[in-house]
């Protein structure tokens, strides 16, 4: 029985050239987190593993920094970074929890944070 919920930063926007923190939070479960994956569409950005620590995909090494916590910081944003991002929590014994974040990278200075929402 999967009782946990993932809270994410939801729909967010940021300025081109700036940076943004993607964050997910798993709650309402006593399951142990064994690994967290961060993905952009079908591309793996980073992994944080309980035994191995962080691994940043080579193609993103210059623009992605881990943290804070299990979050991910995207730097030097381009309009091509617009899209869906997923945090995938691998847990024991519950299984996998997935959270979704939509990032829009704007040319102008009108970027504003969207509301938070929960994915059961």
């Amino acid at each position: 029985m999967m009782t946990g919920t993932i809270e994410t930063t939801g729909n967010i926007s940021a300025e081109k050239g700036g940076s943004i923190i993607l964050q997910c939070h798993l709650s309402s479960t006593t399951a142990q987190v064994t690994q967290v994956n961060w993905e952009q569409q079908d591309q793996l950005l980073a992994i944080c593993n309980a035994d191995l620590g962080w691994h940043i995909s080579p193609s993103f090494k210059d623009r992605v920094a881990p943290g804070p916590g299990l979050g991910l910081t995207l730097q030097s944003l381009t309009v091509n970074d617009t899209g869906e991002y997923f945090c995938i929590y691998h847990t024991y014994p519950d299984g996998t929890y997935t959270g979704r974040i939509f990032l829009e990278v704007l040319e102008s200075s009108v970027a504003e944070h969207g509301a938070r929402f929960q994915i059961p």
Partner: antibody, heavy 117, light 107 residues
């Protein structure tokens, strides 16, 4: 097994600088954040900053931004903290500690820094 | 910066008693709260991660609860080795911060 080795003590003069080291072993050094935390005598724990050895990314508490510099030598799996313009207020035990999936599962033994003339 | 306030500052108890230590955050930190024990002249030791998750090698008498801004570390049937300082710490955002600590002493 995971180990974070720190020198036992350092004695420096007021106004001088110090470089504290933390040698890591037993794990992949570039895959974990290294944090620095200090504790004045009989006081609480104070977060100084952190560095991700895989990229050199750093974060600092505002209090240490102008005086503290964190660096790593990945070839020797060593993290360093450089602290300048020292005063007696900087006398404390300085710990290094790592963070992966969660903080702070392993700690160094701490370096006792004494700032005195 | 997120401020963590621990209470009480000092707690005098007898071995065998059960206690609850409090940690309150100045803003919502979800479950990004961790508990540490520190004995005199020793490095801190991680007891509980993410508010309630157990750590391998830590006795089951230590447990954590809470989310958001209010957190509790509970110790059931205290043993003499349990006395010392207890700190909470948040990893929700940088700069990471610690609570001021609770000293658990033998009555």
């Amino acid at each position: 097994q995971v180990q974070l080795q720190q020198p036992g003590s350092e004695l420096v003069r007021p106004g001088a600088s110090v470089k504290l080291s933390c040698k890591a072993s037993g794990y992949t050094f570039t895959s974990y954040w290294m944090h620095w935390v200090r504790q004045r005598h009989g006081q609480g724990l104070e977060w100084i900053g952190n560095i991700f050895p895989g990229s050199g990314t750093t974060n600092y508490d505002e209090k240490f931004k102008n005086r503290g510099t964190l660096t790593v030598d990945t070839s020797s799996s060593t993290a360093n903290m450089h602290l300048s313009s020292l005063t007696s207020e900087d006398s404390a035990v300085y710990y290094c500690t790592r963070e992966g999936l969660y903080p702070f599962d392993y700690w160094g033994q701490g370096t006792t820094l004494t700032v005195s003339s | 910066d997120i401020v963590l306030t621990q209470s009480p500052a000092t707690l005098s108890v007898t071995p065998g008693d059960s206690v609850s230590l409090s940690c309150r955050a100045s803003q919502n930190i979800r479950n990004n709260l961790h508990w540490f024990q520190q004995k005199s002249h020793e490095s801190p030791r991680l007891l509980i991660k993410y508010a309630s998750q157990s750590i391998s090698g830590i006795p089951s008498r230590f447990s954590g609860s809470g989310s958001g801004t209010d957190f509790t570390l509970s110790i059931n049937s205290l043993e003499t080795e349990d006395f010392g300082m207890f700190f909470c710490q948040q990893s929700n955002s940088w700069p990471y911060t610690f609570g001021g600590g609770t000293k658990l002493e033998i009555k």
